[in-house]
């Protein structure tokens, strides 16, 4: 077999070839959140397990202080699921001038922080009204998409109400990213 | 064009290069489930279409007896959507001492079975309370994430109630995995 | 370092190697939908932002007239999230002969159009009953899976009711695809 048989043509390749097993990747899983100070006017960020059980980081993708650190520029697929659970009273009870009240809601945001840029960028948002009829409820919000990230970017997952996150099992609430 | 222009440096490559088109991949689609014996204390597993319509398996990724067989070790993205449909009575009707009753729920679990390990591992779980007000209801649960798998691992999709799964269309309920 | 150390063996490689950064990719984000003529008996298609903000197309993946154009054959991961919002009256009020009424619903379909084939193919569908109790509601539907596509195929996202789509933020409603 001649090596040339699979040599890429000039048309095909515009970047160095690289082994897939060497790409930055992470899958983080839920841990219990302890009460902390939140930034004003910003949803609180979740912190994560990064090495026990199903969780891992590899190939220079590091997790530190609620953030995934992007080690090289490129297109990444980023995903998260957060399972929420809580209890709501019947949300159609309280009406003002015959109008239905503003429903309770649950929201997940995957946020990018770039040190050179003053404001975080919201990459993905999943938001749901919760209007269960006087009952314990639980439900997941799943997000996933591809983004062009730069070396040094940081990713985090923010939620509307940290006390409603189901932290009991690593398969219910998770966060991951991998270089394509 | 010199072949070396795209030769990876020692720093870049820690595994053999391989063509993307050669990677194990599968997308399975729903079929009508026939009644079968379920294991005690375990949600029943779905079986799948693996070659007709949108469904396929390729590059040594095989489907057999409700399982996707992992042909080589590596990091895989695994996903599934299950659409459920059913009918619930108003779940706040039945109360004991004025308290809301435990809601009905629907659950999907993507499970890994390793022959050398006695217990299956739950990789992903999506679970939702269903508390619709006296109505036919339908809704999907979607899951997807990346996991490090070993050659010989087997993947299946388990559901809380097989009789509620919408098996009518291949685009509503599906299961897939691909090597990254 | 000898180039041969990472030369793929005959067993490993059945297709030309190619750089990942050169693969067709797109992430499209929501824009306000203008009223248009819809095809009879077909859900209306959304149109998208393809270059501003988080949106991009690259490596010959083009967006035109509501469609993503597939520039080369291969296996693609395709995804979309659509966030809906609306207001429903209590949907258990209207009954016929004691039976619950047909609930309102929201549906997203990712559709493939192949010029040589008369009918579009539905690749992915997410559909949910909406039966909120007299309240403003909002919720996302997320879809994602892998499909074998041919050069020249076109992808679009159809929704059951274009007027319920939340077009306010690029992180809430989006559509993307990338060659694996």
């Amino acid at each position: 077999l001649k090596g040339q048989e699979f040599a890429p043509s000039h048309q095909q390749v515009y970047a160095p070839l690289r082994a897939d097993g060497d790409k930055p990747r992470a899958h983080l899983t839920v841990v219990r959140q302890t009460p902390t100070q939140h930034f004003k006017n910003q949803f609180p960020a979740l912190h994560w397990e990064h090495e026990l059980g199903l969780a891992f980081t590899k190939n220079r993708m590091n997790y530190t202080n609620k953030f995934l650190l992007i080690p090289e520029s490129g297109d990444y697929f980023i995903y998260s699921q957060v399972t929420f659970r809580g209890m709501t009273s019947e949300c159609s009870e309280i009406r003002q001038a015959g109008r239905p009240n503003k429903p309770d809601s649950i929201t997940v945001v995957i946020t990018k922080v770039t040190d050179s840029y003053p404001e975080p960028t919201q990459l993905l948002m999943g938001t749901k009204s919760v209007c269960e009829v006087g009952s314990n409820w639980f439900q997941p919000i799943y997000l996933g998409a591809m983004f062009s990230l730069q070396e040094g970017d940081k990713l985090m997952v923010n939620v509307s109400d940290i006390s409603l996150v189901d932290y009991t099992k690593e398969d219910k609430t998770f966060f991951g990213a991998f270089l394509l | 064009l010199k072949g070396q222009e795209f030769a990876p440096s020692h720093q870049q490559v820690y595994a053999p290069l391989r063509a993307d088109g050669d990677k194990p991949r599968a997308h399975l689609t729903v079929v009508r489930q026939t009644p079968t014996q379920h294991f005690k204390n375990q949600f029943p597993a779905l079986h799948w279409e693996h070659e007709l319509g949108l469904a396929f398996t390729k590059n040594r990724m095989n489907y057999t007896n409700k399982f996707l067989l992992i042909p080589e070790s590596g990091d895989y993205f695994i996903y599934s959507q299950v659409t459920f449909r059913g009918m619930t009575s108003e779940c706040s009707e039945i109360r004991q001492a004025g308290r809301p009753n435990k809601p009905d729920s629907i659950t999907v679990v993507i499970t890994k079975v390793t022959d050398s390990y006695p217990e299956p591992t739950q990789l992903l779980m999506g679970t939702k309370s269903v508390c619709e007000v006296g109505s036919n209801w339908f809704q999907p649960i979607y899951l997807g994430a990346m996991f490090s798998l070993q050659e010989g691992d087997k993947l299946m999709v388990n559901v809380s109630d097989i009789s509620l799964v919408d098996y009518t269309k291949e685009d509503k309920t599906f299961f897939g995995a691909f090597l990254l | 370092l000898k180039g041969q150390e990472f030369a793929p063996s005959h067993q490993q490689v059945y297709a030309p190697l190619r750089a990942d950064g050169d693969k067709p990719r797109a992430h499209l984000t929501v824009v306000r939908q203008t009223p248009t003529q819809h095809f009879k008996n077909q859900f209306p298609a959304l149109h998208w932002e393809h270059e501003l903000g988080l949106a991009f197309t690259k490596n010959r993946m083009n967006y035109t007239n509501k469609f993503l154009l597939i520039p080369e054959s291969g296996d693609y991961f395709i995804y979309s999230q659509v966030t809906f919002r609306g207001m429903t009256s209590e949907c258990s009020e209207i009954r016929q002969a004691g039976r619950p009424n047909k609930p309102d619903s929201i549906t997203v379909v990712i559709t493939k159009v192949t010029d040589s084939y008369p009918e579009p193919t539905q690749l992915l569908m997410g559909t949910k009953s909406v039966c909120e109790v007299g309240s403003n509601w909002f919720q996302p539907i997320y879809l994602g899976a892998m499909f074998s596509l041919q050069e020249g195929d076109k992808l679009m996202v159809n929704v059951s009711d274009i007027s319920l789509v939340d077009y306010t933020k690029e992180d809430k409603t989006f559509f993307g695809a990338f060659l694996l």
Epitope: R32, P35, T36, M87, S163, Y167, T168, K169 | K102 | -
Partner: antibody
Framework: EVQLVQSGAEVKKPGASVKVSCKAS????????MHWVRQAPGQGLEWMGW????????NYAQKFQGRVTMTRDTSISTAYMELSRLRSDDTAVYYC???????????WGQGTMVTVSS | DIQMTQSPSSLSASVGDRVTITCRAS??????LNWYQQKPGKAPKFLIY???RLQSGVPSRFSGSGSGTDFTLTISSLQPEDFATYHC?????????FGPGTKLEIK
Amino acid sequence: EVQLVQSGAEVKKPGASVKVSCKASGYTFTGYYMHWVRQAPGQGLEWMGWINPKSGGTNYAQKFQGRVTMTRDTSISTAYMELSRLRSDDTAVYYCAVGGSYDAFDIWGQGTMVTVSS
Amino acid sequence: DIQMTQSPSSLSASVGDRVTITCRASQSISSYLNWYQQKPGKAPKFLIYGASRLQSGVPSRFSGSGSGTDFTLTISSLQPEDFATYHCQQGSSPPFTFGPGTKLEIK
């Protein structure tokens, strides 16, 4: 450091009311549910209810419904529990507790002894 | 309400012993089971959540297991500071209820 500091011991007559305060520090007060749990001498722990400091919404155990009122003052990060129509079997240590999730109690106050005696 | 029972109500053991305390719920509570340690005159201390997950800072000699209705707390090798009362608590649905407690005493 997360801390909950409760008001001091109280002695009350049967039929009276008591109001116990719980001042929170070291975390975002409105971000986490505040619970009240009591423990009668030599007995187990008994959950009384919660308040969501952000919304003011409450959930009381059936046993205390109609007798307990939980309130909060977000400006001073303080939660209050008032128990009315006191009986001798209300003699107990009353704890406030906060959790990272609404269903468990990570951090506890030091407790407030309430004695109901004629 | 969901009733929680614990056994034994008290037990005597020595430093270095392995001890197991069981907790049972009157209906399934999935994995929503928490364990607390309480010493005389003190507030309870959070030990284990989600039936088996150790709260940060809790020594690894403590472990929990179970799901559904039956749960156990195990201390693999008793230390002098472990002699206390242990409470289980269900977090599945309000009203949150505690077991009556298990008093662990020095033999």
